[in-house]
């Protein structure tokens, strides 16, 4: 999960025609594991915004040291700043914790741009606005970093919520969520509601704004509308899923569905953008440009570099198309689609023009590591990471930004054949060369 576009730091390749609707299922979706209903103490426990990541308050050590920690479903280490750094207001001071245990082992994590390194240990960890438990978890104490921490982001560490397979230095280092589930009676499920601002925030507003919710141990029904649709987790490393079709304003990109998942498709809260494989990105941009052709924008805008500004309140949302991703369903030959609006994929940027303007960056970008459904996608939806049942659920978020004409949507079912063929099988390589940084 990294910068520019990957937070904190990654700001990172048939069947019959789709579209035939199956009768809507009338039965309520099967019971999810864990508590259902209300998790009042966890609602609104995230702050931040898509450009710099969403963070939760955590405490580490005895007596507890409070830190803000980036919520990252695209990595699997719990790592915190543990030495002074120009961008950190505070850091984990191991020497002040009576419960810190040194594992006498180092960890080095390089990214395409930047890196962090540190020392492994364990300590007691809790989430004040989370479940009322304290667990002993592995902690990477970051002692050196480059282009990892973000100036002004207000977080001091990262909570990798993915699986042990991608933990560093290796899969023997148990991730935080595994430790949490093992040491408590908390069900093996969490859910995220990331609430994008939808308009530029000045620094004061940004620090005060509520960013969303991380519900640990279940699902909060107040955070979404409609029903939840689930897609299987293809493999437990990243939260890998399979995309079977992509549409721009209802127009199929008509690519071999393997291209959409080349070399994987993941759900990653630590990446800002919707990132697409090169061929898919080029086709998508061509289609988006065509749909919005009454206005022209410079190439730098489509590359996510230049900002485009409109008079405050006059952003022409209507000229930009919706983007729909069809995901493999839980039932054979059945898929569902998630649809995002330009309000999700045009990311507001503050402090660049004047207060009389609303300025945006195009937040769909090219990837060489597969599709990454980052904050741009997640801000439209309530996303359930149902680890117990190896599936990810999507429902329309109660906080997503929309207008009076269009809304984000999760719809299905659709008939889709041969969906298994859409998954890309990564050639087996020496594991030491497998993960060389996430752009």
């Amino acid at each position: 999960t990294h910068l520019g576009i990957r937070l904190p730091l990654r700001s990172g390749l048939a069947g019959p025609p789709l579209g035939l609707r199956l009768p809507r299922e009338t039965d309520e979706e099967s019971e999810e594991p864990g508590r259902r209903g209300s998790f009042v103490e966890m609602v609104d426990n995230l702050r931040g915004k898509s450009g710099q990541g969403y963070y939760v308050e955590m405490t580490v050590g005895s007596p507890p040291q409070t830190l803000n920690i980036l919520v990252d479903t695209g990595s699997s280490n719990f790592a915190v700043g543990a030495a002074p750094h120009p961008f950190l207001h505070r850091y984990y001071q191991r020497q002040l914790s009576s419960t810190y245990r040194d594992l006498r082992k180092g960890v080095y994590v390089p990214y395409t741009q930047g890196k962090w390194e540190g020392e492994l240990g364990t300590d007691l960890v809790s989430i004040p606005h989370g479940p009322n438990v304290t667990v002993r978890a592995n902690i990477a104490a970051i002692t050196e970093s480059d282009k990892f921490f973000i100036n002004g982001s207000n977080w001091e560490g990262i909570l990798g919520l993915a699986y042990a397979e991608i933990a560093r230095p290796d899969d023997s280092l148990e991730p935080f969520f595994d430790s949490l589930v093992k040491q408590t009676h908390i069900p093996n499920i969490f859910s995220l509601q990331l609430c994008g601002a939808g308009f530029p925030l000045n620094q004061t507003e940004a620090l005060a704004s509520v960013g969303g919710s991380m519900i640990i141990g279940g699902i909060d029904h107040s955070l979404y509308t409609g029903r939840l649709w689930y897609t299987p987790i293809r493999r437990e490393w990243y939260y890998e899923v399979i995309i079977v079709r992509v549409e721009i304003n209802g127009q199929d990109l008509k690519m071999d569905c393997k291209e959409y998942n080349y070399d994987k498709s993941i759900v990653d809260s630590g990446t800002t953008n919707l990132r697409l494989p090169k061929k898919v990105f080029e086709a998508a941009v061509k289609s988006i440009k065509a749909a919005s052709s009454t206005e022209k924008f410079p190439d730098g805008f489509w590359l996510g570099e230049q900002l485009v500004c409109w008079q405050a309140g006059t952003t022409p949302w209507n000229i930009f198309p919706v983007i729909s991703l069809y995901l493999m369903g839980e039932v054979t030959n059945q898929s569902f689609r998630i649809t995002i609006l330009p309000q999700q994929y045009l990311r507001p940027v503050e402090d660049v023009a004047t207060s009389q303007d609303d300025c945006y960056k195009f937040a769909v970008s090219q990837s060489s590591t597969g599709t990454v459904m980052g904050a741009v996608i997640m801000e439209g939806f309530y996303v359930v990471f149902d680890r117990a049942r190896k599936r990810i659920g999507f429902a329309v978020s109660a906080c997503h930004v929309h207008d009076e004409f269009r809304t984000a949507a999760v719809e299905g079912p659709f008939v889709t054949a041969d969906m298994e063929d859409c998954g890309y099988n990564i050639p087996q390589t020496d594991e030491s060369t497998l993960m060389t940084g996430r752009a």
């Epitope: 190439d299 570099e305 485009v308 023009a353």
Partner: antibody, heavy 120, light 108 residues
Framework: QLQLQESGPGLVKPSETLSLTCTVS??????????WGWIRQPPGKGLEWIGN???????YYNPSLRGRVTISVDTSKNQFSLKLSSVTAADTAVYYC????????????WGRGTLVTVSS | EIVLTQSPATLSLSPGERATLSCRAS??????LAWFQQKPGQAPRLLIY???NRATGIPARFSGSGSGTDFTLTISSLEPEDFAVYYC??????????FGGGTKVEIK
């Protein structure tokens, strides 16, 4: 080759509306490769962007002039026009029309400019 | 709002000398910066775009460099026709709106 020529009155009274036209010759204003814009320069001072227009009619204006400025296009005449209302002496300037090329980014071709004086 | 500050305001040099003009942005504009030359009584002329690319017909003695917040226009050996006012403009924020205040290159 493509040329731009500004035209319009050189003297406008305070509180009235300044109206200028830019005629494009040697090429089509309906090219999808360009926006067209207006820039002004008060005597002895620097350049100030006024606004841009695409042949479809899509416009962008300088926030400091919004509410007073209107840019329009007439593809049949290969022209685009500037109207600036409620003018004051501070609007006295040389007004340039220009083509926004190089991927809609840079003013790569300019008219010669026309001096408009606001005075009673 | 992004502010472009040009320095020096005036540069007094002799023909054949090297001219170095600076443009500083109040925040990063990546490489989205242009340089224009304006002679008295004439319209500005595009010299450099995307910080370092020479526009069509511009002599090789003109070169641009820089990215982020600091940019330089260099005229390697001043010709008599190069004495003029030079402006920078950022287009990181689109549409292009912000010009620098200008640097006058005059004969010493």
């Amino acid at each position: 080759q493509l040329q731009l020529q500004e035209s319009g009155p050189g003297l406008v009274k305070p509180s009235e509306t300044l109206s200028l036209t830019c005629t494009v010759s040697g090429g089509s204003i309906s090219s999808s490769s360009y926006y067209w814009g207006w820039i002004r320069q008060p005597p002895g001072k620097g350049l100030e962007w006024i606004g841009n227009i695409y042949y479809s009619g899509s416009t962008y204006y300088n926030p400091s002039l919004r509410g007073r400025v209107t840019i329009s296009v007439d593809t049949s005449k290969n022209q685009f026009s500037l109207k600036l209302s409620s003018v004051t002496a501070a609007d006295t300037a040389v007004y340039y029309c220009a083509r926004l090329g190089h991927g809609y980014n840079y003013f790569d071709l300019w008219g010669r400019g026309t001096l408009v004086t606001v005075s009673s | 709002e992004i502010v472009l500050t040009q320095s020096p305001a005036t540069l007094s040099l002799s023909p054949g000398e090297r001219a170095t003009l600076s443009c500083r942005a109040s925040q990063s504009v990546s490489s989205y910066l242009a340089w224009f030359q304006q002679k008295p009584g004439q319209a500005p002329r595009l010299l450099i775009y995307d910080a370092s690319n020479r526009a069509t017909g511009i002599p090789a003695r003109f070169s641009g460099s820089g990215s982020g917040t600091d940019f330089t226009l260099t005229i390697s050996s001043l010709e008599p026709e190069d004495f003029a006012v030079y402006y920078c403009q950022q287009v990181y924020v689109w549409p292009p709106r912000t010009f620098g205040g200008g640097t006058k290159v005059e004969i010493k």
